[in-house]
């Protein structure tokens, strides 16, 4: 069969039906990321709370992130939301402190449960906080007598009862 003449048009061009199906370059502010396209797509514009992370080219779309104080949400940074503090998560009512037993070490995302050291047979070396996960120490069996000058770690706790520095809560 006859080959489609448009299949010869590379990325960055489009098959121009108005000009005998010759390959025309994508106009400014548009792109085609694959060959054989009959139209070029309009470049994404990173405006308002969005910031240009990667400029649009004739073969690839622009990529956006967020202006200072905001961070991306959704595939391809479809939304920007305000940063919270470490130790918080964003809810419908604004930024809220992480509940006891959970932490968030970033300005975005949700609070996650502390690691349960006892599940790995380890003890808690450093208590968890709203901003930091617990640090698990070696299992009691790993500590041979006199082998360490470190104060022995606290015994493992039941899930949900890890020690926590609750100052300021």
């Amino acid at each position: 069969g006859l080959q489609d003449p448009c299949s010869n048009c590379p990325a960055g061009t489009f098959c121009d039906n108005n000009r005998n199906q010759i390959c025309s370059p994508c106009p400014p502010n548009s792109f085609s990321s694959a060959g054989g396209q009959r139209t070029c797509d309009i470049c994404r514009q990173c405006k308002g709370v969005f910031r240009t992370r990667k400029e649009c080219s004739s073969t690839s779309n622009a990529e956006c992130d967020c202006t200072p104080g905001f961070h991306c949400l959704g595939a391809g940074c479809s939304m920007c939301e305000q940063d919270c503090k470490q130790g918080q998560e964003l809810t419908k009512k604004g930024c809220k402190d992480c509940c006891f037993g959970t932490f968030n070490d970033q300005k975005r995302g949700i609070c996650r449960p502390w690691t349960n050291c006892s599940l790995d047979g380890k003890s808690v070396l450093v208590n968890g906080t709203k901003e930091r996960d617990v640090v698990c120490g070696p299992s009691p069996a790993d500590l041979s007598p006199g082998a360490s000058s470190v104060t022995p770690p606290a015994p493992a706790r039941e899930p949900g009862h890890s020690p926590q520095d609750i100052e300021g809560r």
């Epitope: 514009q45 990173c46 405006k47 308002g48 709370v49 910031r51 240009t52 202006t67 200072p68 104080g69 905001f70 305000q82 940063d83 919270c84 503090k85 470490q86 918080q88 964003l90 009512k93 604004g94 930024c95 300005k107």
Partner: antibody, heavy 118, light 107 residues
């Protein structure tokens, strides 16, 4: 309607700490950030820092070691503290709201003049 | 820090004139530029953000354009109440920085 009002002492001695309050109304503190900007007499605008709705702060590195911004949601108030002031800190100090659409200032207080002098 | 250089530093125009203020960023800031108007003895007022979007309530005679490093604020027909100093501001990265200002006088 949206309103912001700065208040605090108009005169501060060198080496002391400048403390200002911004009292706001007409918008929710859980949704909007607030910036502090200053303007020395006859000069341009300088951004000092911002406190976001969740309480996270970002400061101008040129002042970072001296500036602290905080808020008291229950009083609808924001505060600016600038330590170890000199005559170069004499300026009109403004607080301004950050909208949800960009990292800019859409509503400003009327400003308060702070003079640093002994 | 990103430097924002405004020109001219001052200009004089008659009522009805078309006036253009330019702002040049020391590095690419996309379209993350705002413009403010400050009337004598008053606080600044937002005019434009995202280089070209008018803030609510801003008269249509004010327009903004540009991207990358070069930006323009245009007043299509100057009015007596436009007597003010105009500032650009970049918000592409911290610290947020302002231009030095352009003082508009009315002849």
């Amino acid at each position: 309607q949206v309103q912001l009002q700065e208040s605090g002492p108009g005169l501060v001695k060198p080496s002391e700490t400048l403390s200002l309050t911004c009292t706001v109304s007409g918008f929710s503190l859980i949704s909007y950030g607030v910036h502090w900007v200053r303007q020395p007499p006859g000069k341009g605008l300088e951004w000092l820092g911002v406190i976001w709705s969740g309480g996270s702060t970002d400061y101008n590195p040129s002042l970072k070691s001296r500036v602290t911004i905080s808020k008291d949601t229950s009083k609808n108030q924001f505060s600016l503290k600038l330590s170890s002031v000199t005559a170069a800190d004499t300026a009109v100090y403004y607080c301004a709201r950050n909208p949800l659409t960009a990292t800019v200032m859409d509503y400003w207080g009327q400003g308060t003049l702070v003079t640093v002098s002994s | 820090d990103i430097q924002m250089t405004q020109s001219p530093s001052s200009l004089s125009a008659s009522v009805g004139d078309r006036v253009t203020v330019t702002c040049r960023a020391s590095q690419n800031v996309g379209t993350n530029v705002a413009w403010y108007q400050q009337k004598p003895g008053k606080a600044p007022k937002a005019l434009i953000y995202s280089a070209s979007y008018r803030d609510s309530g801003v008269p249509s005679r004010f327009s903004g354009s540009g991207s990358g490093t070069d930006f323009t604020l245009t007043i299509s027909s100057v009015q007596p109440e436009d007597l003010a100093t105009y500032y650009c501001q970049q918000y592409n990265s911290y610290p947020l920085t302002f231009g030095g200002g352009t003082k508009l006088e009315i002849k």
